[in-house]
């Protein structure tokens, strides 16, 4: 599995999308879990509705929400009020029985809020047509981890 990197700004929302084949995973609930260490278990953060037909309903666990477009084949996770401790490796999972298939491995990176430590000369004013909020909400940048890159920095 390649790892996809999603970057978000501290204090803002980050939206992670995990595409999948809706035929292959038809009838299966989904989950979002956090990888504990490189070889450790994946700790469940939040899962979709217990009734698969209601998977479109957004479910929250703290500041993390999950919703599933079961026909379109896209699982969406929202991390609200992103904090530095949210950075790390996660997985989108498809559940069947006691088993879980990995849909996507995700590395969440948290960028410092540029407005928290800006110089006066670095101020950015959005154009008149866009509101300040719209310019920042659900901000995410994704890329695939390059070969040789490691999702867990070596510990000293």
């Amino acid at each position: 599995h390649n790892t996809t990197v999603f970057q978000g700004v501290a204090g803002q929302s980050l939206q992670v999308s995990c595409p999948y084949d809706s035929m292959k995973h038809w009838g299966r609930r989904k989950a979002w879990c956090r990888q504990l260490g490189e070889k450790g278990p994946c700790q469940r953060v939040v899962s979709t509705h217990n009734l698969w037909l209601l998977s479109f309903l957004r479910r929250w666990n703290g500041s993390t929400a999950i919703t599933d477009d079961t026909l379109g084949g896209t699982l969406t996770i929202t991390l609200r009020n992103l904090q530095p401790h949210d950075a790390g490796l996660y997985q989108c999972q498809s559940l069947h029985g006691s088993e879980a298939d990995t849909l996507r491995k995700v590395l969440v990176e948290v960028l410092a809020d540029p407005l928290d430590h800006r110089d006066a000369g670095d101020l950015w004013f959005p154009g008149e047509s866009e509101s300040f909020e719209d310019a920042h909400v659900e901000h995410s940048i994704s890329r695939s981890l390059l070969e040789g890159e490691i999702p867990f920095p070596p510990t000293s």
Epitope: H1, P19, M23
Partner: antibody
């Protein structure tokens, strides 16, 4: 544009193996099934199996189970089909064919095909 | 697996005349998501197969509107309203509702 380019023709001895490659370009390789379909001379199309490169999941037709192995290398966007214990009846053109992951508005059909690879099994 | 049966196996048609190919599946091709994954392919002489119609009646982009698909459940039909010389080849119906995917035996269309 989407392209599937297969490896060249092969002549093999009975009992040996053959590995055919299919290099994909122009789309998200990880998010589509890659199917392998074969066609014996003058015969119809026969589905052999498929792989979802995103997670390596495979399915095989019962007839080929145990003899065929389908793999994919995401780093090079290449799918492979290896058929072992070859016999003369395996002489055929082997095609790879893409099938987009199921989404509204998409076909969930094999919309792009490779040019085919002729495998001849002869002693 | 699902058995796909096509009729006729060969067809000889005068240019400008209509043609019809039938395809029957051994079990319903309606998936529990409501879609029917029945497709039609054309293999022209010396070429790889090409997708014509997907999910029963949807023409693939670039396919002339003289081709149309219909049917439901287990019975499906491909119609060519006015056959042209370039339509020669073997037509296959196929299903991707259930694994293993399966094809019909093929119908060879010739021009009179």
């Amino acid at each position: 544009q989407v392209q599937l380019v297969q490896s060249g023709a092969e002549v093999k001895k009975p009992g040996s193996s053959v590995k055919v490659s299919c290099k994909a370009s122009g789309y998200a390789f990880s998010l589509s099934w890659m199917n392998w379909v074969r066609q014996a001379p003058g015969q119809g199309l026969e589905w052999m199996g498929r792989i979802y490169p995103g997670d390596g999941d495979t399915n095989y037709a019962q007839k080929f189970r145990g003899r065929v192995t389908i793999t994919a290398d995401e780093s090079t966007s290449t799918a492979y089909m290896e058929l072992s214990s070859l016999r003369s009846e395996d002489t055929a053109v082997y095609y790879c064919a893409r099938l987009l992951r199921n989404q509204p508005g998409e076909s969930y059909a094999m919309d792009y095909w490779g040019q085919g690879t002729l495998v001849t099994v002869s002693s | 697996g699902v058995v796909m049966t096509q009729t006729p196996l060969s067809l000889s048609v005068t240019p400008g005349q209509p043609a019809s190919i039938s395809c029957r599946s051994s079990q319903s091709l309606i998936h529990s998501n409501g879609y029917t994954y029945l497709h039609w392919y054309l293999q022209k002489p010396g070429q790889s197969p090409q997708l014509l119609i997907y999910k029963v009646s949807n023409r693939r982009s670039g396919v002339p509107d003289r081709f149309s698909g219909s049917g439901s459940g287990t019975d499906f039909t491909l119609k060519i309203s006015r056959v042209e010389a370039e339509d020669v080849g073997v037509y296959y119906c196929s299903q991707s509702t259930r694994v293993p995917y399966t094809f019909g035996q093929g119908t060879k269309l010739e021009i009179k």
